[in-house]
């Protein structure tokens, strides 16, 4: 099951998955001025069997102004620091989730990828939180969140982390230096519509769409 929404927002903190469960989707987003190559993948999917998991596609971007395809290369350091989701493959992780069966590692960067990676997580995914640069962590419990399925609905557990404004930074488990501080993602809306589907199962629609129309006549 895909999780209905993003992990919770914690003021002055960012989250990171150490590994991605099978079924996780990563959108092939390109930075401004670039787009997916023609016939390029729309997303990458963590897929595999009990012994090995990997991302089933590669994302590729090309300039919006040209039709030339780009190569799959590692960004230069100045490009890499733009990326909001930095790779954290430290051997000091408390549990090396990436080596667990049914998990994929962080996909390598692709040229001209968007500055923020958009993942769609599955039930059972765990993410870890750290305070951004300039803030210190006060732990009341685990600084992590897990996507759980309860009564047919998905929800993320609330991480027990407060980031206070002291010039000291906390770190992800096993990380030696704090990463550059990305700004938080837009806050999620929380309105829900409870509905009975045609399949006669009571479910919570965590998302709704509503269309309306404007017409104009050319003079």
């Amino acid at each position: 099951e895909l999780c209905d929404d993003d992990p919770p927002e914690i003021p002055h903190a960012t989250f990171k998955a150490m590994a991605y469960k099978e079924g996780t989707m990563l959108n092939c987003e390109c930075k401004r001025g670039f787009r997916r190559i023609k016939s390029g993948s729309l997303y990458m999917l963590c897929t595999g069997n009990s012994s090995h998991s990997s991302w089933d596609n590669q994302c590729q971007c090309t300039s919006s102004a040209t039709r030339n395809t780009t190569k799959q290369v590692t960004p230069q350091p100045e490009e890499q620091k733009e990326r909001k989701t930095t790779e954290m493959q430290s051997p000091m992780q408390p549990v090396d989730q990436a080596s667990l069966p049914g998990h994929c590692r962080e996909p390598p960067p692709w040229e001209n990828e968007a500055t923020e990676r958009i993942y769609h997580f599955v039930v059972g995914q765990m993410v870890y939180y750290q305070c951004v640069q300039g803030y210190r962590a006060l732990h009341r419990g685990p600084a992590e969140s897990v996507c759980k399925m309860t009564h047919g609905k998905t929800r993320w557990t609330q991480p027990q982390l407060i980031c206070t404004g002291e010039m000291e930074t906390s770190q992800f488990p096993g990380e030696e230096k704090p990463q550059a501080s990305p700004e938080g993602r837009p806050e999620s809306e929380t309105s829900c519509l409870v509905t009975t589907t045609d399949f006669q199962i009571q479910t919570e629609m965590a998302a709704t769409m509503e269309t309306s129309i404007f017409t104009t006549e050319y003079q």
């Epitope: 729309l42 993602r185 837009p186």
Partner: antibody
């Protein structure tokens, strides 16, 4: 015919910028036709070839609303127009009927 | 563009029957295929994505399989609410494309 229409699609209950918006239409008694997709994250678009030049998709992240404008309307543009969440299209709008008549 | 061909175009079945719908892609789309059910006057509803993953709230009598170019949707023990038109759709590359639909009617 010749006029334009702008259909809006207001999303709620999820992080708007984490997903794109797909637009699909359905002519009376016909199947589903993909019109295009827009990234709510960065505004990148991809349009169906046959609509290129007539269609424009935009988003307003401040109101979590997507828009689809179709210009130079013809009678064969008569259809129900749907928006749906991202390319997986797991959540759909109720549809907006556009009738092009002379 | 990737073409999707569904078969049969229509089928008449009774409640309790098992129904199989197939979808063939004109080129390899890995497992990036979704199935939707649309009832008259309603928007389509996602049933299955990534060829076999059941969308939230969809009963387990629906199942999907296949990869590459050949895909199958099976509905076991058809229920009254399952009647309508089923569409397959590829989400591998743009432009996204739909099959022409399979109408499942009451016999």
């Amino acid at each position: 015919p010749g006029s334009s229409v702008k259909v809006s699609c207001k999303a709620s209950g999820y992080t708007f910028t984490s997903y794109g918006i797909s637009w699909v239409r359905q002519a009376p008694g016909q199947g589903l036709e993909w019109m295009g997709w827009i990234s709510a994250y960065n505004g990148n678009t991809n349009y169906a070839q046959k609509l290129q030049g007539r269609v424009t998709m935009t988003t307003d992240t401040s109101t979590s609303t997507a828009y689809m404008e179709l210009r130079g309307l013809r009678s064969d543009d008569t259809a129900v127009y749907y928006c749906a969440r991202d390319f997986r299209m797991d959540v759909w709008g109720q549809g907006t009927t556009v009738t092009v008549s002379s | 563009d990737i073409r999707l061909t569904q078969s049969p175009s229509s089928v008449a079945s009774s409640v309790g029957d098992s129904v199989t719908v197939t979808c063939r892609a004109s080129q390899d789309i890995k497992r990036r295929l979704a199935w939707y059910l649309q009832k008259p006057g309603q928007a389509p509803k996602l049933l299955i994505f990534d060829a076999s993953r059941l969308h939230t709230g969809v009963p387990s009598r629906f199942s999907g399989s296949g990869s590459g170019t050949d895909f199958t949707l099976i509905i076991n023990s058809l229920q009254p609410e399952d009647f309508g038109t089923y569409y397959c759709q590829q989400a591998n590359t743009f432009p996204q494309t739909f099959g022409q639909g399979t109408k499942v009617e009451i016999k």
